[in-house]
């Protein structure tokens, strides 16, 4: 039995990768900053967990996807007030018991130092300094990402 | 080049429904968020409300109840309604590109709501 | 009543530097470092001329600068030409989703 936020996460990745092939992205798009090989977008307003991974694939992006401790370092290196939260692509899956990114992976227990419970609508956000889970449904913001590729690319689903 | 064109009755009458059509050219509906802003003659600038193109909204305090925003991402327009309008709606409406939810980087000209019997 | 404060106008004369000023509170201004600032000529749509405080866009001449302190922002324009006679509007986010607007300043060339 999925949860409505695994659905929805579901859902919009699965609507995204009905087309195969798009034309690779060689600079960020205005008002997004680019980290590596991605293109960032950190919201300005605040929206529930759902609504911030709905935006995000409206705007052909996905809610934030960290591979490793030092992604995560660089991202929270952006932000430029440690009172801020920003959600990411990482929620809680009841019917697995594990936290889940968006494309469908499970967290390496190892990559994130997480603060608080993990336990069903449980979402996953970042601070300047910290990892927090909080409620799906709390207002914050979050943070966009667009993958930079300069050649034609498979779309996947964490792209 | 990003353009945005406004367009609606000129004029309406005390309780009815004020309703106004943004078209956006150059720029895709989809990646940005979009807005009403209003200027009564002679004075300031008012944030009426903002549409995502998830579909949600987010309305001005003071006229959240009268508010209804929509958007047609396929003839990349979005539009307001304003129901049970007064006098005091009588104002020149302007939409507008909201990238981030925060501040507004082009502009339709604007076109005049007069509200009155 | 506008949310944020400004003067109704200032002027100067061509090649000085003008500085006009926006307060708010701490929900508002204060709060957050997303000031921006329109210029609007009469009878034309508001031009954003700054944003994030400081920011500005492409096109916007460098004479145009923002700042902020605490619960006031401020646009100095430098080097005034007679182009720059026009109204401007401060503008900040103010909290859960909302934007306010300021009253406006008449800037007039001399």
């Known amino acids: 039995q999925k949860s409505s936020i695994e659905k929805c996460s579901v859902d919009i990745q699965q609507s995204r990768n009905k087309t195969t092939e798009r034309p690779g992205l060689l600079n960020c798009p205005i008002y997004w900053q680019q980290l590596r090989e991605k293109c960032l977008l950190f919201s300005h307003t605040v929206n529930p967990w759902n609504n911030s991974l709905a935006d995000c694939s409206t705007k052909e992006s996905s809610l934030l996807l960290i591979r490793d401790k030092d992604e995560l370092i660089h991202t929270q290196n952006l932000i430029r007030d440690k009172a801020i939260l920003f959600w990411i692509g990482l929620n809680f899956s009841l019917s697995e018991k594990n936290w889940k990114w968006i494309n469908g992976s499970f967290l390496n227990s190892n990559d994130l130092e997480i603060r608080g419970d993990a336990k069903e609508n449980s979402c996953i956000s970042i601070s300047q300094t910290s990892v927090y889970s909080e409620y799906c449904s709390t207002e914050i913001r979050w943070i966009c990402q667009k993958e930079l590729t300069p050649v034609r690319n498979k779309v996947y689903p964490d792209s | 080049q990003v353009q945005l064109q406004e367009s609606g009755p000129g004029l309406v009458k005390p309780s009815e429904t004020l309703s106004l059509t943004c078209t956006v050219s150059?720029?895709?509906?989809?990646?940005?968020?979009w807005s009403w802003i209003r200027q009564p003659a002679g004075k300031g600038l008012e944030w009426i409300g903002r549409?995502?193109?998830?579909?949600?909204?987010n309305y001005n305090p003071s006229l959240k109840s009268r508010l209804t925003m929509s958007l047609d991402t396929s003839k990349n327009q979005f539009s307001l309604r304003l129901s049970s309008v007064t006098a005091a709606d009588t104002a020149v409406y302007y939409c507008?590109?909201?990238?981030?939810?925060?501040?507004?980087?082009?502009w339709g000209q604007g076109t005049l709501v007069t509200v009155s019997s | 009543q506008s949310a944020l404060t400004q003067p109704p106008s200032a002027s100067g004369s061509p090649g000085q530097s003008v500085t006009i000023s926006c307060t708010g509170t701490?929900?508002?201004?204060?709060?957050?470092?997303?000031v921006s600032w329109y210029q609007q000529h009469p009878g034309k749509a508001p031009k954003l001329m700054i944003y994030?405080?400081?920011k500005r866009p492409s096109g916007v001449p460098d004479r145009f600068s923002g700042s902020k302190s605490g619960n006031t922002a401020s646009l100095t324009v430098s080097g005034l030409q007679a182009e720059d006679e026009a109204d401007y509007y401060c503008?900040?986010?103010?909290?859960?989703?909302?934007?306010?607007f300021g009253g406006g300043t008449k800037l007039t060339v001399l």
């Open positions: 549409i995502y193109t998830s579909g949600s909204t």
């Open positions: 150059g720029s895709s509906i989809s990646f940005y968020y």
């Open positions: 994030e405080v400081s």
């Open positions: 507008a590109r909201d990238p981030l939810g925060t501040f507004f980087d082009y």
């Open positions: 701490s929900s508002d201004v204060g709060g957050y470092n997303y």
């Open positions: 503008s900040s986010y103010a909290g859960i989703n909302n934007v306010v």
